[in-house]
Amino acid sequence: TPEVWVQVRMEATELSSFTIRCGFLGSGSISLVTVSWGGPNGAGGTTLAVLHPERGIRQWAPARQARWETQSSISLILEGSGASSPCANTTFCCKFASFPEGSWEACGSLPPSSDPGLSAPPTPAPILRAD
């Protein structure tokens, strides 16, 4: 069964800067990745970035840089200042649309005990929804 993992890390140098990494563990090719915060995309969450293998990448503040790390994983740097800045308990969600398998989504947040700049290794997060 395909799985999605989400890793959230706060940068040690900038405490309002977060790095979100997400990956898809499945055999299909990725057709779209959507990163949101505040909950799953379409369920109250706000879209931060959308990545498409051919058409490119779209990102919205406070997203600073979204990119493909591999064919099945992405990273997103958020830089916050003011009302739109993320906080330590913010939930980030990644939805992978895989062709032809369907859509898989998982969410994660900063581990409560983590020091800035440190985080647990990426492990599959609970799958919230499979379309």
Epitope: S31, H52, E54, R55, R58
Partner: antibody, heavy 118, light 107 residues
């Protein structure tokens, strides 16, 4: 209500220039990709330009180097500067929003007519 | 560039008929395809996006299917207001390209 209103069309001679405008309202204009699509009388739809929320621009080969798409987010406005116009550019020009990127245009204006003729 | 071949270019049908329009992409586009309806003198209106998702406010008699290179728009029971021209659009890669259109006329 989401609305797009084009203006600036008219009659122009071959080799001339024209600038089309599109006024957007009812949505957060700065977030969305925007496009121009044209349709010659009795013909099909042809995509002629696109611009993303970061200002990067995209064109088909048929207009590259002649047409320039731009946006002014503070004025909720989209533009199409058309230079070196040809008779084949005669068409209705539609402004369109791609509100759910990358799923194509979801909202269209009513169009403005461009006629290139001597 | 990706070519979109739409068929038929025109068809005649009666109210209540089931109508099927096909779009074929020159290369795989996954499910990055939309369907549009256009009536004379009007702007196009999106019916379907992402190959099979129904646009909000559009009647459920319209449905889309397919992936990869073969796509279909189906009108389950043609209504008088459905007589129009239909276009497919691939949004998989630039340049964005439309099919040539299918004119649905009254038989």
């Amino acid at each position: 209500e989401v609305q797009l209103v084009e203006s600036g069309g008219g009659l122009v001679q071959p080799g001339g220039s024209l600038r089309l405008s599109c006024a957007a309202s009812g949505f957060t204009f700065s977030r969305d990709d925007m496009h121009w699509v044209r349709q010659a009388t009795g013909k099909g739809l042809e995509w002629v330009a696109g611009i993303d929320n970061a200002g990067d621009t995209y064109y088909p080969g048929s207009v590259k180097g002649r047409f320039t798409i731009s946006r002014e987010n503070a004025k909720n406005s989209l533009y199409l500067q058309m230079n070196s116009l040809r008779a084949g550019d005669t068409a209705i020009y539609y402004c369109a929003r791609e509100g759910q990127w990358p799923y194509g245009m979801d909202v269209w204006g009513q169009g403005t007519t461009v006629t290139v003729s001597s | 560039d990706i070519q979109m071949t739409q068929s038929p270019s025109s068809l005649s049908a009666s109210v209540g008929d089931r109508v099927t329009i096909t779009c074929r992409a020159s290369q795989g586009i996954r499910n990055d395809l939309g369907w549009y309806q256009q009536k004379p003198g009007k702007a196009p209106k999106r019916l379907i996006y992402s190959a099979s998702s129904l646009q909000s406010g559009v009647s459920s008699r319209f449905s889309g299917s397919g992936s990869g290179t073969e796509f279909t728009l189906t009108i389950s029971s043609l209504q008088p207001e459905d007589f129009a021209t239909y276009y497919c659009l691939q949004s998989n890669s630039y340049p964005l390209t439309f099919g040539g259109g299918t004119k649905v006329e009254i038989k």
